[in-house]
Interface confidence: low
C-alpha cells in the first residue's frame, strides 16, 4: 500500500484514486514506440525495449501492438488511456496483470494487441492460447 503522505503524481494532473479511494500512482511501462522485431511464431516474446517510462497520467496502462506484413514485423510499446481507443480498438483487457495478445482485424497485415496494468507488463507479450481471459487471475485489477 502507498503511504498516505506520499505525493501521487509526476505531473499536475488531477489526483486519481482507485475504487477503494487509495491514491493511484502512474504506471511503469515499456515505451519504445514502434521498433522492428524478430518476435514470430513464439508463445511469448520479450519486448527488447530498454526504456521503462512513467506514464504521463495515473489512469494510463501499458500497451503492446505486434504487426506483421509482407515486409517486416514491428512491436510497439506505449502507455495509453484505456478510456480512449488505440489503433481504433478499445483496450478490453486493460485490467489484466499480463499482456495477452489478441488478434484484431486489420487489412493487409496480421495485427495483435494487448494491454495490462502491472509495472512493465508490456515487456513480456504472450501469444499462447493457454493464457486466456477465462483465467480469473488475469481479471484482477492491480491497485498500485
Amino acid at each position: 500500500t502507498i503511504p498516505p503522505h506520499v505525493q501521487k503524481s509526476v505531473n499536475n494532473d488531477m489526483i486519481v484514486t482507485d475504487n477503494n479511494g487509495a491514491v493511484k500512482f502512474p504506471q511503469l511501462c515499456k515505451f519504445c514506440d514502434v521498433r522492428f522485431s524478430t518476435c514470430d511464431n513464439q508463445k511469448s516474446c520479450m519486448s527488447n525495449c530498454s526504456i521503462t517510462s512513467i506514464c504521463e497520467k495515473p489512469q494510463e496502462v501499458c500497451v503492446a501492438v505486434w504487426r506483421k506484413n509482407d515486409e517486416n514485423i514491428t512491436l510497439e510499446t506505449v502507455c495509453h488511456d484505456p478510456k480512449l481507443p488505440y489503433h481504433d480498438f478499445i483496450l478490453e483487457d486493460a485490467a489484466s496483470p499480463k499482456c495477452i495478445m489478441k488478434e484484431k482485424k486489420k487489412p493487409g497485415e496480421t495485427f495483435f494487441m494487448c494491454s495490462c496494468s502491472s509495472d512493465e507488463c508490456n515487456d513480456n507479450i504472450i501469444f499462447s492460447e493457454e493464457y486466456n481471459t477465462s483465467n480469473p487471475d488475469l481479471l484482477l485489477v492491480i491497485f498500485q
Partner: antibody
Amino acid sequence: QVQLVESGGGLVQPGGSLRLSCAVSGFEFRRYAMSWVRQAPGKGLEWVSAISASGDRTDNTDSVKGRFSISRDNSKNTLYLQMNSLRAEDTAVYFCAKGIARSGKNFFDPWGQGTLVTVSS
Amino acid sequence: DIQMTQSPSSLSASVGDRVTITCRASQSISSYLNWYQQKPGKAPKLLIYAASSLQSGVPSRFSGSGSGTDFTLTISSLQPEDFATYYCQQSYSTPPTFGQGTKVEIK
C-alpha cells in the same frame, strides 16, 4: 531537496573488493530505476550498472559482468555496488544517478557527488 | 553497442560567443539523446533531454537539436559559468553510452 550521497570508495589492491553505497533522500526511491556511472581520471563517462525500481532486474556493462553486482534496499533508500576482483582499469570516480523515464525519453538526473575508487598495489 | 562521437574534442571561446557542439551516433537513435555539463570535481548535470527538451532550471541560452544520427548542442551566448566539459548520451538502447566529451575553454 533531492540528494544522492555516495560512500565506500578508497584505495584497494588489485583482486580486492569494495562495496559502494548511495544514500538517497528527497524522492520516492522505490519508484525509480538507479544506475552507477564511472569516470576514470581525466576520462569520459561510462555507464556501469543499473537496477530496476523493485530490484528484480539488473544489468551491467560487459567489462564488469561477473565481478560487480548492483543491489538496493528500498526500506533504507540505499543503492549499492559490490565490486569484486578489482582491476587497475576500474580506478575511477563512481557516481550514482537516478534514472528518469517519461513518455519514452529517459536520462540520468540528478547525480551524486561521486566517490573515488583507486585500484593499485 | 552504439558509439557516440563528439566534435570538437575541445574548443576555445570568449564570453558572449555562440558555441556549437556536435554529437554523432553510430546508428539512428531517433531523438533519444541527452546532453550533460560537467565542471571539474563535480557531478554531471543534465541540460537537455530527448534531443531538444530543456531540463528545468537550465538557462534558455542552451538548446539542442537533431534526430536520427546527428545532434547539436548550442550555447547562444557563452557565459563565464559555461566553461566546462559537455557530454552527449544516447538512451535508445542498453548499454547507454556517452560521447567522449567536449571541453569548452576560455580563449
